[in-house]
């Protein structure tokens, strides 16, 4: 019960958290200007991963993409990468653990199976939430950097009449989303990975012992058959070996995890 | 068409009071920043304030802060211009104006006198 | 605040000929964000209110004759007519449109000669 609970938890805090991973990528405030050294300015800037926009006091709103790709920061791309291939991972991640949610019923999908797919979206949702935290991160101290360097020179004139403001650009909305989003998915993949131990079948290792039967050399090995968690259609007896002349060190084996595909 | 007429206007004592409306039609007010503009008598435009489309900001002039209040009634399609401790220098024809792209004030309305004397 | 400083204060000009009208900001009124210049020109005529010219420097407003222009960037513009007319006989205002407060300059009386 505590293993479903905390895969179906780990689902829905991963679904929430590409959901916002997807909401930052395309939200258009990635940074917005820095508005302390003009709190009454009647027109304000912000930025997106792919387009800046501009909010006049009259209410008009004019946005536009950013058209070029060669001549765009190595490190806004970079970012773009990072957020694009958390998306994706995530999404893969969202559909793989789908199949692997144990109160879902998929045929007779065995719990051993479960457990590899969900350890496997537990895994993509971190790497997913690592991805969109490094993105955000590394725009973020993009920002800072050029604040500062703005700052500088945060006026430049000819002889003191004339001053020229640099706009400075602060976090935006959509970096918290980011972080926030991140680390919910994170969170997720790691309650995915948690669930996975809980939801491999508990193996015992006996040793392998051989039943000499005169006329037939056959080897029966004991924890031959699949356990039965009592979930799923697991009620099939499997044996290992068939019958067949084997010498003692071939059979007496310890049970591996291909003993139990 | 786009019409603001203001309304209001008049002889005041210096300290009095006065409250200024601008009536707007033909648009969609609620949509549209709005403005007021004065002009003292053979003098230059000067902007007193301005209030954002939903009416959560505004902004005043120095010369007026603290004694004018710009408001507005999206209900009534109508602009507000309370003007309080009012001096000498603030006689002047008060105008309402629409701001469209680039702030830019596309519509004017003919103006209302404001005369502060005693 | 910003200044707006308008000359000449003003000036008279047979019909027909060209005139140019300029105006200078104490700070500069182009937004890095859209590349546009947040400024206004405004036609006052005698007994009427203020009439929109020009919005971001150059962008003509509906109705305008394309004899009239404007230009400029950053601290200076300019508003020019081509072939004056009778008609635009007025006082020229321009106006900052980037930061509250919104200043307006003294204005370019036009007259004919």
């Known amino acids: 019960m505590a293993v479903t609970a905390c895969q179906g938890l780990g689902f829905v805090v991963s679904l929430i958290g590409i959901a916002g991973i997807i909401a930052a990528t395309c939200m258009d405030q990635w940074s917005t200007q820095d508005l302390y050294n003009n709190p009454v300015t009647a027109v304000f800037n912000y930025q997106g991963l792919w387009r800046s926009c501009v909010r006049e006091s009259s209410g008009f709103t004019e946005c536009r993409g950013y058209f070029t790709l060669l001549g765009l920061p190595a490190m806004l791309q970079a970012v773009r990468a990072l957020m694009i291939v958390g998306i994706v991972l995530g999404a893969i991640g969202l559909l793989v653990s789908i199949f692997a949610l144990k109160c879902i019923r998929i045929g007779s999908m065995e719990d051993s199976a479960k457990a590899n797919m969900t350890l496997t979206s537990g895994i993509m949702f971190i790497v997913s939430g690592l991805c969109a935290i490094a993105g955000v991160s590394v725009f973020a101290n993009m920002l800072v950097t050029n604040f500062w360097m703005s700052t500088a020179n945060m006026y430049t004139g000819m002889g003191g009449m004339v001053q020229t403001v640099q706009t400075r650009y602060t976090f935006g909305a959509a970096l918290f989303v980011g972080w926030v989003a991140g680390g919910l998915t994170l969170i997720g993949g790691v309650m995915m990975c948690i669930a996975c131990r809980g939801l491999a079948p508990e193996e015992t290792n006996y040793k392998a012992v051989s039943y000499h039967a005169s006329g037939h050399s056959v080897a029966y090995k004991p924890g031959g058959f699949k356990a039965s968690t009592g979930f799923g259609s697991n009620t099939k007896n499997k044996k290992i070996y068939d019958g067949g002349a084997r010498t003692e060190d071939e059979v007496q084996s310890y049970p591996s995890k291909h003993d139990y595909v | 068409e786009v019409q603001l007429l203001e309304s209001g206007g008049g002889l005041v004592q210096p300290g009095g009071s006065l409250r200024l409306s601008c009536a707007a039609s033909g648009f969609t007010f609620s949509s549209y920043t709005m403005s007021w503009v004065r002009q003292a008598p053979g003098k230059g435009l000067e902007w007193v304030a301005t209030i954002i489309i939903g009416g959560s900001y505004t902004y005043y002039a120095d010369s007026v802060k603290g004694r004018f209040t710009i408001s507005r009634d999206n209900s009534k399609n109508t602009l507000y211009l309370q003007m309080n401790s009012l001096r000498a220098e603030d006689t002047a024809v008060y105008y309402c104006?629409?701001?469209?792209?680039?702030?830019?004030?596309?519509?004017w309305g003919q103006g209302t006198l404001v005369t502060v004397s005693s | 605040d910003i200044v707006m400083t308008q000359s000449p204060d003003s000036l008279a000009v047979s019909l027909g000929e060209r005139v140019t009208m300029n105006c200078k900001s104490s700070q500069s009124l182009l937004n890095s964000g859209n590349q546009k210049n947040y400024l206004s020109w405004y036609q006052q005529k005698p007994g009427q209110p203020p009439k929109l010219l020009f919005y971001w420097a150059s962008t003509r407003e509906s109705g305008v004759p394309d004899r009239f222009s404007g230009s400029g960037s950053g601290t200076d513009f300019t508003l020019t007519i081509s072939s004056v007319q009778a008609e635009d006989v007025a006082v020229y205002y321009c106006?900052?449109?980037?930061?509250?407060?919104?200043?307006f300059g003294q204005g370019t009386k036009l007259e004919i000669k």
């Open positions: 104006t629409r701001l469209v792209k680039g702030n830019a004030m596309d519509y």
């Open positions: 106006q900052n449109d980037y930061s509250y407060p919104f200043t």
